[in-house]
């Protein structure tokens, strides 16, 4: 029997055993976040899954993932949004640390689909474990891409208070216009809700003392912020690892010195 | 086995100040959500309050918010329903429950009866 | 607020099958668990039913739970005269940042 036809993407397919990783994580998150306790994983899991199979993986809509968006009634207390741009790893760190403060990936939907990659096809309820759009070469209203435009948006639509991210100071852009912190966050902040975006730029060499926060990619950041009538302050964190340790261990004396 | 006894209950004037407590016993008190619930007269069930274990957080009905506070003293076994600003329509049987790792109310008192009339 | 749909009141002959339908929407039944109760005239309410369709022990198989969408059933079968109470579905409701009950549905064995 010859396999049926399959459209070929120029990225990497679904990641292996999709359903079941989602689903396990949605009940790890409810049993590890008490206050979620009534969450309905398998509902859960239907919403998702509803927004991308049967669907042509080119052609992915923000009101697709409505009907799950509508589950993120998660609230973020003030002061406690931690956005990031191309410095994941750090941002979570960093909230695995200070639990009182959260990424998108500390809340569930962004919990659920961290690292992950999936897409179904056109009028068949598989999920295509072969290849999926590729934003670039491909298209970029594809599943993985649209969601994480859909929650991003969301998430900074309910941020309050002072709002943090976190950029990367390594980069030739610090702040990237073309990020989803650049295109979406940036724009979804609500300055009625929103004082004052801080902005920390992590540096990467541990001799550099250059004060990143003149950077020009941060100057356009500022205007772009201060437009919307929102406040702007800019942090240099020159040593990530001692950042984090401060974090850990305030009391520490060579924390004192702020 | 586990057992929720309320009090507190009894007749108070429109305007006026009650305090219902809840002795728990038979289980883990500090580890649990514990609720309160009430039916009104010739009603059906209505979620009033929930508290969370830890770091307490509180949640309220929006026909009670702003006039009732749910608290607990998990060294005292006890939950408590201090409740202001009485109206009428408050008047019922109140529930303390405990709630299982779903959500569920797995646990109920007898009810101690509430009546608010001039 | 707006609580769960329950018909007010479900009836039938001893050791017949009684459904008793809830119905609400994508906020409270839609993404979270629903809960069934048991509540006879002056005696606190009972746990039948949780996470959809979960019994807990000493309640008897002859109560069972289901979840499709917005809305869920509870279903009696072998109906008995114990069985004469009102039912009462609850589940968080996402909207209100609490729980809602159903308006309960007396159940009558004839």
């Known amino acids: 029997v010859l396999p049926r036809w399959r459209q070929q993407w120029s990225g990497s397919g679904t990641t292996s055993r999709f359903p079941e990783t989602v689903l396990a994580r949605c009940v790890k998150y409810t049993e590890v976040h008490p206050e979620m306790r009534h969450v309905d994983c398998q509902s859960v899991w239907d919403a998702f899954k509803g927004a991308f199979i049967s669907k042509y993986p080119c052609n992915i809509t923000e009101e697709d993932y409505q009907p799950l968006v509508k589950l993120g009634t998660q609230t973020v207390p003030c002061n406690k949004t931690l956005l990031w741009s191309r410095i994941k790893d750090l941002a979570h760190q960093f909230t695995q640390v200070q639990r009182d403060m959260f990424t998108l990936e500390d809340m569930l939907l962004g919990y659920l689909a961290d690292d992950l990659t999936w897409c179904g096809e056109f009028n068949t309820f598989e999920i295509n474990y072969q290849s999926c759009p590729d934003w670039r070469k491909d298209c970029s209203n594809n599943p993985v891409s649209v969601f994480w435009k859909t929650v991003s948006r969301r998430f900074a639509e309910t941020a309050c208070g002072v709002v943090h991210v976190m950029l990367n100071g390594s980069r030739s852009k610090i702040f990237d216009k073309n990020s989803t912190f650049g295109s979406v966050e940036v724009h979804n902040l609500q300055p009625e809700k929103v004082q004052a975006l801080e902005a920390w730029v992590i540096h990467g060499g541990r001799e550099d003392s250059r004060d990143l926060c003149q950077d020009p990619t941060i100057k356009e950041l500022e205007s772009i912020i201060s437009k919307r009538n929102i406040r702007f302050f800019c942090k240099n964190i020159y040593r990530p690892d001692k950042f984090l340790q401060c974090v850990k261990n305030p009391e520490d004396s060579s924390c004192l010195s702020g | 086995q586990v057992q929720l006894v309320e009090s507190g209950g009894g007749l108070v004037k429109p305007g006026g100040s009650l305090r219902l407590s809840c002795a728990a016993s038979g289980f883990t008190f500090s580890d649990d959500y514990m609720s309160w619930i009430r039916q009104a007269p010739g009603k059906g069930l209505e979620w009033v309050a929930s508290?969370?274990?830890?770091?307490?957080?509180?949640y309220y009905a929006d026909s009670v918010r702003g006039r009732f506070t749910i608290s607990r003293d998990n060294a005292k076994n006890s939950l408590y329903l201090q409740m202001n600003s009485l109206r009428a329509e408050d008047t019922a049987v109140y529930y303390c429950a405990r709630e299982g790792w779903s959500g569920e109310f797995t646990d109920w008192g007898q009810g101690t009866l509430v009546t608010v009339s001039s | 607020q707006a609580g769960l749909t329950q018909p007010p009141s479900a009836s039938g002959t001893s050791g017949q099958r009684v459904t008793i339908s809830c119905s609400g929407s994508?906020?409270?039944?839609?993404?979270?668990?629903v809960y069934w109760y048991q509540h006879l005239p002056g005696t606190a309410p009972k746990l039948l039913i949780y996470k959809n369709n979960q019994r807990p022990s000493g309640v008897p198989d002859r109560f069972s739970g289901s979840k499709s969408g917005n809305s869920a059933s509870l279903a009696i079968s072998g109906l008995r005269s114990e069985d004469e109470a009102d039912y009462y579905c609850a589940a968080w409701d996402d909207s209100l940042s609490g729980y809602v009950f159903g308006s309960g549905t007396k159940v009558t064995v004839l």
């Open positions: 508290v969370s274990n830890g770091r307490p957080t509180t």
């Open positions: 994508s906020s409270n039944i839609g993404f979270h668990f």
